[in-house]
C-alpha cells in the first residue's frame, strides 16, 4: 500500500490521542535505555510503511502485535485516513484469523514496540517532509 | 557504564549566549536520546529540549523556542546545548540527561551552574 | 502541557518514619511517571519509574503507587540518607514536565 494520500494530520491526532497512551500502557515496566533504536523513517508515508510492517507482520520472536489494543487503534486510523488502505487488508486480515495466538509479551515484542515508539516520534515530526 | 560529564561553570552577561557541553561515554551515542532539563534556584525542574544524535533532530520546550540550541558532535560523541538573549532568571543549573524512546531520565550529568549577572 | 502538582512542599520527620508524598497530574498519564531524589549540589537520582518499579540499587523501603491522575511515593522507614528533595515527572507526553518538589527534612 502507498500511504503518500493518507491524512497525515488526522491520524497524527489519532496517535496524540489515543494510540502513543495504548503503546505508552504495553511498554509498562520497561527500561529506559533497555532497547537500542534500529529503525529509522524519512517522511510520513515510509513512516507509516514502517509502522504498518512492524505492527501487523509476524516476526521471528513476535508472534503478533495485532490484537493489542496500539494496533487495532493504529488499523482504523489508516482504514479512515488513507484512501483504499482497508481494501488491501481484506486478505491481510483472514490470514490473520487463521494464525491467531494466545498473547504474549515477549522481550522481542517489546524491542519491536520500542522501535513503534521511535517511528511514530519520527511520524509526529512537526517539519518532516511528507514525500 | 554510561556516564555524562559536563563543562565547568560560566559566569555571564545578560543579553550574552552559553553553551553547556555533554560528553558522553559508555554507550553507542546514536541509540539514545540527549535532553537538557534546568534548575533555577528554589525552582522546579524544567525540561528544555532534545536531541536525536542518529539525525540531529531537535524537540524543544515551547518555553525556550527560539533562545535554545541543541547540537552534536558526532565524533566527539558530544552534546551542546546554547541559550541565547541570558537574563538573570536563567541563572541555573543546567543538566544534560539520557533516555530511550521511553522519556524517564536514568543517567544524568552531573550539572553545570550558570550565572546571570550584570 | 500536563502539570504535575506535587505535595506537600516542606515536610518534617523522624528517621523511622513511614511519609508519603503525592503528586497530581493534570489529566491522565497512565502510569507513566518516575520520581527522583536530589540532595544538595547533586544531580537528580531515578527512584522509581512505572509508577511503581524500583530503579537498579534503590532500598525495598521506597514504593511507588498510583495511576491515571495520583500518584504517592513512599518512604516506609526513614533513615538519615533519605532527607532529600523529591520529585515526581510525567513521560506520557510531550512535553515532560515535573512536578516542583517536596523537601523532606529531619524534625
Known amino acids: 500500500y502507498d500511504f503518500t494520500n493518507c491524512d497525515f494530520e488526522k491520524i497524527k491526532a489519532a496517535y496524540l490521542s489515543t494510540i502513543s497512551k495504548d503503546l505508552i500502557t504495553y511498554m509498562s515496566g520497561t527500561k529506559s535505555t533497555e532497547f537500542n533504536n534500529t529503525v529509522s523513517c524519512s517522511n510520513r508515508p515510509h513512516c507509516l510503511t514502517e509502522i504498518q510492517s512492524l505492527t501487523f507482520n509476524p516476526t521471528a520472536g513476535c508472534a503478533s502485535l495485532a490484537k493489542e489494543m496500539f494496533a487495532m487503534k493504529t488499523k482504523a486510523a489508516l482504514a479512515i485516513w488513507c484512501p483504499g488502505y482497508s481494501e488491501t487488508q481484506i486478505n491481510a486480515t483472514q490470514a490473520m484469523k487463521k494464525r491467531r495466538k494466545r498473547k504474549v509479551t515477549t522481550n522481542k515484542c517489546l524491542e519491536q514496540v520500542s522501535q513503534l515508539q521511535g517511528l511514530w516520534r519520527r511520524f509526529n515530526r512537526p517539519l518532516l517532509k511528507q514525500q | 557504564q554510561v556516564q555524562l560529564v559536563q563543562s565547568g561553570a560560566e559566569v555571564k552577561k545578560p543579553g550574552a549566549s552559553v553553551k553547556v557541553s555533554c560528553k558522553a561515554s559508555g554507550y553507542t551515542f546514536t541509540s539514545y536520546l540527549m535532553h537538557w532539563v534546568r534548575q533555577a534556584p528554589g525552582q522546579c525542574l524544567e525540561w528544555m529540549g532534545e536531541?536525536?544524535?542518529?539525525?540531529?533532530?531537535?524537540d524543544y520546550n515551547q518555553n525556550f523556542r527560539g533562545r535554545v540550541t541543541i547540537t552534536v558532535d558526532m565524533s566527539a560523541s558530544t552534546a551542546y546545548m546554547e541559550l541565547s538573549s541570558l537574563r538573570s532568571e536563567d541563572t541555573a543549573v543546567y543538566y544534560c540527561?539520557?533516555?530511550?524512546?521511553?522519556?524517564?531520565?536514568?543517567?544524568w550529568g552531573q550539572g553545570t551552574l550558570v550565572t546571570v549577572s550584570s | 502541557d500536563i502539570q504535575m502538582t506535587q505535595s506537600p512542599s516542606f515536610l518534617s520527620a523522624s528517621v523511622g518514619d513511614r511519609v508519603t508524598i503525592t503528586c497530581k497530574a493534570s489529566q491522565d498519564v497512565v502510569t507513566a511517571v518516575a520520581w527522583y531524589q536530589q540532595k544538595p549540589g547533586k544531580a537528580p537520582k531515578l527512584l522509581i519509574y512505572?509508577?511503581?518499579m524500583r530503579h537498579t540499587g534503590v532500598p525495598s523501603r521506597f514504593s511507588g503507587s498510583g495511576s491515571g491522575t495520583e500518584f504517592t511515593l513512599t518512604i516506609s522507614s526513614l533513615q538519615p540518607e533519605d532527607f532529600a528533595t523529591y520529585f515526581c515527572q510525567q513521560y506520557s507526553s510531550f512535553t515532560f514536565t515535573f512536578g516542583c518538589g517536596t523537601k523532606l527534612e529531619i524534625k
Open positions: 512505572w509508577a511503581s
Open positions: 536531541i536525536d544524535p542518529s539525525d540531529s533532530y531537535t
Open positions: 540527561a539520557l533516555t530511550g524512546t521511553i522519556n524517564y531520565f536514568d543517567y
